[in-house]
């Protein structure tokens, strides 16, 4: 059995911060979980990782220098990633594994989200400014 | 799915039972085997679970060091040992299939269950 | 440990009369509650699980509901095939504690 993963074809961060919410076809809240989201086409790069146990708090980290947070719902994860660069822009793939109780579970590969990072633009100072108002 | 409980059985005070639970019609190791105690009169007590892909096990803290629990893969079946009984373990004992509702637990499968008579 | 407080201990009640069992624990179990119907001398049999979700098969005059730490088991139309014994049981973590059961019994 795969938990199955539904995620938003396509976000665009505008300020370079982006929400992008993992929706399972599976309660999370009385299990050991991790729920990660993976950059690139071969899910190469570990973005973020949110480690839950029913228990005890959220754990959320990221090994590869990403700015994030996670949300746990009952049957979502929502990453909160910031401080998003252009050349960042790619396909992030959700993942979840259930790790206790047995037996371990994960889930069939997503669709994917395409989050398209457009950096701030900073509105340029005139080169000829007009005369000013007295 | 079909769990097969063994026997009724009448033992002393002090002397240890082996109850077995025979699993078929799924993958055996596959599912968690949980095991209920019933006295009669008295409600449900949840005693422990087995897991047996990893041999993983997790027990009630009132019945560790009563109740011991292992499988043998081989023939499909849960083993449950009571030690050092009294009349206090006089019991139907039920062993259930634990399944996972996309992330809510339930025990739809149970086997007949298994009397066991403490007497002198 | 989470704590379960069924209530009533036991209930008579006549054919085609309406009846609600409750469930209470001591924390929120976040729905991870099944409900169970036992007869004498027989095994358990699974009614309902994830507090409100009727197992397939189990006649729609059973249903169930709450969440947090409070929930209930309404059976309407009595027949007298219900009549037996009922208990609730949690999943929030182990020990996966049953509740002390209620006695349904004809009138």
């Known amino acids: 059995n795969k938990i199955l993963v539904k995620q938003s074809p396509m976000l665009v961060a505008y300020d370079n911060a982006v929400n992008l919410s993992c929706k399972y076809s599976y309660n999370l809240f009385s299990r050991e979980f991790r729920a990660s989201l993976h950059k690139g086409l071969d899910s190469a790069v570990e973005v973020c990782v949110v480690y839950g146990n029913y228990s005890q708090q959220l754990q959320v980290y990221s090994k590869t220098g990403f700015n994030c947070d996670g949300k746990l719902g009952n049957e979502s994860v929502t990453f909160y990633l910031q401080n998003l660069y252009v050349n960042q822009t790619d396909i992030y793939f959700c993942k979840i594994e259930v790790m206790y109780p047995p037996p371990y579970l994960d889930n069939e590969k997503s669709n994917g989200t395409i989050i398209h990072v457009k950096g701030k633009h900073l509105c340029p100072s005139p080169l000829f400014p007009g005369p000013s108002k007295p | 799915v079909q769990l097969q409980q063994s026997g009724a059985e009448l033992v002393k005070p002090g002397a240890s039972v082996r109850l077995s639970c025979k699993a078929s019609?799924?993958?055996?190791?596959?599912?968690?085997i949980h095991w209920i105690k019933l006295r009669s009169g008295q409600g449900l007590e949840w005693i422990g679970w087995f897991y047996p892909g990893s041999n993983d096990i997790q027990y009630n803290a009132k019945f560790k060091g009563k109740a011991t629990l292992t499988a043998d893969k081989s023939s499909s079946t849960v083993y449950m040992e009571l030690t050092g009984l009294t009349s206090e373990d006089s019991a139907v004992y039920f062993c259930a299939r634990r399944d996972d509702f996309s992330g809510y637990d339930a025990l739809p499968y149970w086997g007949q269950g298994t009397l066991v008579t403490v007497s002198a | 440990d989470i704590q379960m407080t069924q209530s009533p201990a036991s209930l008579s009640v006549s054919v085609g009369e309406t009846v609600t069992i409750t469930c209470r624990t001591n924390?929120?179990?976040?729905?991870?509650l099944a409900w169970y119907q036992q007869k004498q001398g027989k095994s358990p049999q699974l009614l309902i699980y994830a507090a409100t979700h009727l197992v397939e098969g189990v006649p729609s005059r059973f249903s169930g509901s709450g969440s947090g730490t409070q929930y209930s088991l309404k059976i309407t139309s009595l027949q007298s095939e219900d009549f037996g014994n009922y208990y609730c049981q949690h999943f929030w973590g182990t020990p996966c504690t049953f509740g002390g059961g209620t006695k349904l019994e004809i009138k």
């Open positions: 019609g799924y993958t055996f190791t596959e599912y968690i």
């Open positions: 924390e929120n179990i976040y729905s991870n």
